[in-house]
Amino acid sequence: KSSNEATNITPKHNMKAFLDELKAENIKKFLYNFTQIPHLAGTEQNFQLAKQIQSQWKEFGLDSVELAHYDVLLSYPNKTHPNYISIINEDGNEIFNTSLFEPPPPGYENVSDIVPPFSAFSPQGMPEGDLVYVNYARTEDFFKLERDMKINCSGKIVIARYGKVFRGNKVKNAQLAGAKGVILYSDPADYFAPGVKSYPDGWNLPGGGVQRGNILNLNGAGDPLTPGYPANEYAYRRGIAEAVGLPSIPVHPIGYYDAQKLLEKMGGSAPPDSSWRGSLKVPYNVGPGFTGNFSTQKVKMHIHSTNEVTRIYNVIGTLRGAVEPDRYVILGGHRDSWVFGGIDPQSGAAVVHEIVRSFGTLKKEGWRPRRTILFASWDAEEFGLLGSTEWAEENSRLLQERGVAYINADSSIEGNYTLRVDCTPLMYSLVHNLTKELKSPDEGFEGKSLYESWTKKSPSPEFSGMPRISKLGSGNDFEVFFQRLGIASGRARYTKNWETNKFSGYPLYHSVYETYELVEKFYDPMFKYHLTVAQVRGGMVFELANSIVLPFDCRDYAVVLRKYADKIYSISMKHPQEMKTYSVSFDSLFSAVKNFTEIASKFSERLQDFDKSNPIVLRMMNDQLMFLERAFIDPLGLPDRPFYRHVIYAPSSHNKYAGESFPGIYDALFDIESKVDPSKAWGEVKRQIYVAAFTVQAAAETLSEVA
């Protein structure tokens, strides 16, 4: 129940007043304003947008709005020396070259400063050699090549299709396999939905469209030159050779027209099975090298991009809390885009802008939230979550003591089918209760709740009558808050129908064709899905900042801990003899989960009964809830990933976008049958079970009665 001591508005109308103030027409207007020119991180245009947002947030009524700047490592193509890939004949002549830019969309022909497609942070180089097609370049794809097909990628240039996993993982895998270059391409099987036209006539990717993106493996480090600390004016910077997460081989992205020219000549081994075939009219041969007539031809990459320390700007707005100003609820999303950012990020930034406007309107009427709300427009997200991470590094001591929750606000839509939510289990009940109060925007669900349409279209695989809520992974600005600092986090957006649309992300992701018109014509002409996402994100922030008792249910954590313990145990039980031989037991983990369940249940009972008029007891109970997420943080971090410190969740080591539960144990068990030294390998499994069991038990004890 929302209420606040310091408001002129009747308590029960607080949330309603806030939600009623949100307008689809405003979101549309803001999106248009944010997408007319590119806003690449580190450019003057993005600095100007930061100042515009600062000014408008002040006008909207926030108490203060400041720019927080950092000097971080970014990457840009060389303007006079373009990147491209060629096929060369035996004399070294270039007989085919990939395109140097995407054909601009209608109406944007005269826009300057459209960065050509490139893989950010690729080193320079001009490798040449035979091509090997590696499917999605996932761990399992390289296992197939290496172990089953006996194909050696050492000294080869590999070509991989985008999709399934984060591109940085693809590059890391290729590097480990000994490749000397990587070509990334968008296959129509993944980026062209059947029955839909290409842009500008539909929302599909044209053959000349290319996905930009960074190829770092930062593992939560932030700026590659200042891991763990803010990239401020007195920062000590590592040398480039010691920088975190930079790729060591040249990488370049291309579209499917150019990919066709490379793949159609491929010889060598046939694809191992149909899962290696895309939708191009090519054989999808694995190689190495070209077929008979073309066997003397090679592929050559020409990469001339440069890494440069560049200033970036976050916008940080504050709406001071009336009762608990030292408790922070954060709503953050990024502002920088690869080109126009029609979806990523400006569909999210426009929603944040409207949420700020609505909160500002209430504040001007005399209302204040109970807790402080911080609003953030992050910079350089596309270059490795740099703006958010640097700010969190600079403010880590405040955040770990005062951070209640972080709600992420990148792209509001990646489709228009149903809601998608990833969050901490602490927020499950908040999301359920909120979506039951909101109207569904979906056709065929008029007059029904968002909860109902969401549950119907995206049912939970475990609990009937409930919607699917996913684990947090990474690839967005919540990472530092959740995975490093242990602040309860969540994200929500509208998504596609994953059952019928098997393509990865949305087809025009990170291309020049991600424009305002893409959204306005094809995804959300009425901006009703944007409005719904604004209501979900804004409603979550409102409740987190305003409810007397924090809207966290620790019992939901108990449920998932049991589920995750069962899952990791069943993975381990694929090795029953080794578990006996090396005395591997999960008893300690299951015992800790049982204790957590019992203590969480008792805590929830006390939460119903305590005297909410006693501010000391109220604060004590709220602090136990706030610090529960923090209790899952291991200060030592995960093995070889010191900035991923959450013991229950981490980004998958094989796909940064995906979340993995009990990641320490999972990674210790992964491919354990190929570890040469089984006693050492199973010893590490035992150590990780110990860490997990201890952490769960320690977290449980934070919920016990304090004395």
Epitope: E146, D148, K150, N152, C153, S154, L176, A177, G178, K574, H575, P576, Q577, E578, K580, T581, E673, S674, K675, V676, D677, P678
Partner: antibody, heavy 119, light 112 residues
Framework: EVQLVESGGGVVQPGRSLRLSCATS????????MHWVRQAPGKGLEWVAV??????????SYAESVKGRFAISREDSKSTLYLQMNSLRAEDTAVYYC??????????WGQGTLVTVSS | DIVMTQTPLSLPVTPGEPASISCRSS???????????LHWYLQKPGQSPQLLIY???NRFSGVPDRFSGSGSGTDFTLKISRVEAEDVGVYYC?????????FGGGTKVEIK
């Protein structure tokens, strides 16, 4: 404790057959590629054959010297590896070891069983 | 097939002194993933081979730290910093980068 125990060796005439067994314990046999390696008296080690796991359709490969005559097989339910040796020759005389592969390394070896091919 | 050549054939040693065995392959043993699948085994008299060093330089569990491996490409070395009486036997290098997997001819280490 990981154990591999070979059996089935003995004296056999040239041209005849013999079947070796390797009973294993202490590890989940079905998860691992298994090999046979042999050592002629007073000589060095020679790799003979490998069999993969169920997910790889129990694929096998052989040294040229035994191809077409020897067949490697496994019975996962019994955690046992076999080597069927046909058309035996004098040069097949050796101690035969079964070995468990881990990450492309032969890590654990049995104590061996001696096969003598003699008329 | 890859030929593995070990030198010396025989190595008489004094306890407490260092010893070194060389192994040369007829082709590079560098595999993809940057791995070099060159391993060392010791076969003590009347016993089966036991793994000492895997992938050039990694000591297997329980192997004393007086044993070390080094090398790259085609040239590899096993060193024993201070030989002990229990180290006698035949040492084999082995490559598993290329099929078929092959072994060196062995080096017999005996106490002087």
């Amino acid at each position: 404790e990981v154990q591999l125990v070979e059996s089935g060796g003995g004296v056999v005439q040239p041209g005849r057959s013999l079947r070796l067994s390797c009973a294993t314990s202490g590890f989940t046999f079905s998860n691992y590629r298994m090999h046979w390696v042999r050592q002629a008296p007073g000589k060095g080690l020679e790799w003979v054959a490998v069999i993969t796991v169920k997910s790889d359709n129990y694929g096998s490969s052989y040294a040229e010297s035994v191809k077409g005559r020897f067949a490697i097989s496994r019975e996962d339910s019994k955690s046992t590896l076999y080597l069927q040796m046909n058309s035996l020759r004098a040069e097949d005389t050796a101690v035969y070891y079964c070995s468990r592969e881990l990450g492309q390394v032969l890590v654990f070896w049995g104590q061996g069983t001696l096969v003598t091919v003699s008329s | 097939d890859i030929v593995m050549t070990q030198t010396p054939l025989s190595l008489p040693v004094t306890p407490g002194e260092p010893a070194s065995i060389s192994c040369r392959s007829s082709q590079s043993l560098v595999h993809s993933y940057g791995n070099t699948y060159l391993h060392w085994y010791l076969q003590k008299p009347g016993q089966s081979p036991q793994l000492l060093i895997y992938k050039v330089s990694n000591r297997f569990s329980g192997v004393p730290d007086r044993f070390s491996g080094s090398g790259s490409g085609t040239d590899f070395t096993l060193k024993i910093s201070r030989v002990e009486a229990e180290d006698v036997g035949v040492y084999y290098c082995s490559q598993t980068t290329h099929v078929p997997w092959t072994f060196g001819g062995g080096t017999k280490v005996e106490i002087k």
